[in-house]
């Protein structure tokens, strides 16, 4: 018995070959002897039942001259899994068709961190093995259900599942979209008084995007977090619902989600968490955003440089006179120089030599007041 594997919804070709390699009379039947189709000597395809009943069944007329009389079954259904009989030249050939189906649990659009379950449906009597490969090349294998917990952004794309049965294989491709922000976390470094822009690009595109979101902010100087803004998203249009009066935030109405602060101030330095709840999805998307603010000041004989906000302990804060070696350099959030000499001083926040933030302050001779450019 010949075995043919098929995929639900697609087409399968069941072979039937003549030894004489020329056109001959043939009939395809179900195992219960009901006729499907055939050719009775006039080169015309005759169907066995009503057109509606047999419209999915066909043959390749072009192959008949070569002695090939395949049965083509279109739009395969799971119930097409059975034995088909080809009668020709006083012999019967049995062809077994097994139709398989691989589906993703409930939805192919899943939130980052959620689980993906791939389920194989197979005909009774079959014992296939299945292996799926993620877009980032990770292989998972198992029985009729395969699960991946904690989906990551890199899991977005085409998953390829190979079903193996009796050394024959059939391949399924399933497009999975992991709903997430492009970055889990971002950090913005600003001098005091500068404008601040926060961007929250999504890592996916869908035709219609609807949901609601909120930005909670934990200022370093504050004892508790505060909701800065709430908004709705309807068909990719952002509409602000409620916004705090301090700071005076503005939010763009188009994607990607984008917020602006008129100026960076020490009291705003801290961490925010933007959450986005999408319509018909359980759970929320999250992106963390951090704001570090620098201020350089001179009070009487003391030149001070301070940073506020979430800085890593390995960051270095330095004060140096332009074109000279750093006068002071510490892994701390404030540095100062007593009785600084006149000139342009630079306050630098750096990470392994890379400058993240810089603020200049001009120190005038002792009889005058400092100027901040």
């Amino acid at each position: 018995k010949t075995l043919v594997l098929g995929k639900e919804g697609e087409s399968a070709e069941l072979p039937c070959e003549s030894s004489q390699k020329k056109i001959t009379v043939f009939t395809w039947k179900f195992s219960d002897q009901r006729k499907i189709l055939g050719q009775h000597g006039k080169g015309v395809l005759i169907r066995g039942g009503s057109p509606s009943q047999f419209d999915r069944f066909d043959s390749k007329k072009g192959a008949w001259e070569k002695g090939s009389f395949p049965l083509i079954i279109n739009k395969l259904k799971m119930e097409d899994s059975q034995t088909y009989i080809c009668e020709l030249e006083n012999r019967k050939e049995e062809v077994e068709l097994w139709v398989f189906k691989v589906t993703a649990n409930s939805d192919t659009h899943l939130l980052q961190g959620q689980s993906l379950t791939l389920t194989l449906e197979s005909p009774p009597g079959s014992s296939p093995s299945v292996q799926c490969r993620s877009p980032r090349g990770k292989n998972i294998q198992g029985g009729k259900t395969l699960s991946v917990s904690q989906l990551e952004l890199q899991d977005s794309g085409t998953w390829t599942c190979t079903v193996l049965q009796n050394q024959k294989k059939v391949e399924f491709k399933i497009d999975i979209v992991v709903l997430a922000f492009q970055k889990a976390s971002s950090i913005v470094y600003k001098k005091e008084g500068e404008q601040v822009e926060f961007s929250f690009p999504l890592a996916f595109t869908v035709e219609k995007l609807t949901g609601s979101g909120e930005l909670w902010w934990q200022a370093e100087r504050a004892s508790s977090s505060k909701s800065w803004i709430t908004f709705d998203l309807k068909n990719k249009e952002v509409s602000v619902k409620r916004v705090t009066q301090d700071p005076k935030l503005q939010m763009g109405k188009k994607l990607p989600l984008h917020l602006t602060l008129p100026q960076a101030l020490p009291q705003y330095a801290g961490s925010g968490n933007l959450t986005l709840a999408l319509e018909a999805k359980t759970g929320k998307l999250h992106q963390e955003v951090n704001l570090v603010v620098m201020r350089a000041t001179q009070l009487q004989k003391n030149l001070t440089c301070e940073v506020w906000g979430p800085t890593s302990p390995k960051l270095m804060l330095s004060l140096k006179l332009e074109n000279k070696e750093a006068k002071v350099s510490k892994r701390e959030k404030a540095v100062w120089v007593l009785n600084p000499e006149a000139g342009m001083w630079q306050c630098l926040l750096s990470d392994s030599g890379q400058v993240l933030l810089e603020s200049n302050i001009k120190v005038l001779p002792t009889w005058s007041t400092p100027v901040q450019p």
Partner: antibody
Framework: EVELLESGGGLVQPGGSLRLSCAAS????????MSWVRQAPGKGLEWVSG????????YYADSVKGRFTITSDNSKNTLYLQMNSLRAEDTAVYYC????????????WGKGTTVTVSS | AIQMTQSPSSLSASVGDRVTITCRAS??????LGWYQQKPGKAPKVLIS???SLQSGVPSRFSGSRSGTDFTLTISSLQPEDFATYYC?????????FGQGTKLEIK
């Protein structure tokens, strides 16, 4: 070709009301955001009000908030601006404008209709 | 609301001159700014969208750029038909706001 035609302008006394209409042809109305923009005699352009394609979200300039109402009727492909408690400073040419598919810009404008508020 | 400060308010120039008009936004507005041309008695016409995207049918002598919250419209070589009033418009967020306008006149 997309065309916008405003109507409903005229002379009205302070405190009175007027409803402007903007009939659109050559487009699927519900797809695009729309706006009303005005220009007082000898002055610059002032954005007045906007509405999302779905009609669910409406927006207003502070100068007209609480007095003007923007609506749309997708079945009639028409945008409206209901103006109540009119003031002398509302005297202007009122233009309706269609926004691009992704709200990129106002790509189609009507010729405008004149509103005069005077006693 | 976001304020748009446009300068200069008027400008005299000659055919062939290079002209720049600037708009400053009171907040960061990404690239969500357009430039519009208006001639007396006519409706405005969009020249540039999203800071630098030239609209179809608009001559290439018009260009737009951005530096932070400063936006610039440049006309590389003025033509007689360019004498008009120019407006910037921020469409970053509602309420939208126009600049005060720049009237470009023949010197």
């Amino acid at each position: 070709e997309v065309e916008l035609l405003e109507s409903g302008g005229g002379l009205v006394q302070p405190g009175g009301s007027l409803r402007l209409s903007c009939a659109a042809s050559g487009l699927t109305f519900s797809t695009f955001a729309m706006s009303w923009v005005r220009q007082a005699p000898g002055k610059g352009l002032e954005w007045v009000s906007g509405i999302s394609g779905s009609g669910e979200n409406t927006y207003y300039a502070d100068s007209v908030k609480g007095r003007f109402t923007i609506t749309s009727d997708n079945s009639k492909n028409t945008l409206y601006l209901q103006m109540n408690s009119l003031r002398a400073e509302d005297t202007a040419v009122y233009y309706c404008a269609k926004e691009g598919y992704n709200w990129n810009y106002m790509d189609v404008w009507g010729k405008g209709t004149t509103v005069t508020v005077s006693s | 609301a976001i304020q748009m400060t446009q300068s200069p308010s008027s400008l005299s120039a000659s055919v062939g001159d290079r002209v720049t008009i600037t708009c400053r936004a009171s907040h960061g507005i990404r690239n969500d700014l357009g430039w519009y041309q208006q001639k007396p008695g006519k409706a405005p016409k969009v020249l540039i969208s999203e800071t630098s995207s030239l609209q179809s049918g608009v001559p290439s002598r018009f260009s737009g750029s951005r530096s932070g919250t400063d936006f610039t419209l440049t006309i590389s070589s003025l033509q007689p038909e360019d004498f008009a009033t120019y407006y910037c418009l921020q469409d970053y967020t509602y309420p939208y706001t126009f600049g005060q306008g720049t009237k470009l006149e023949i010197k």
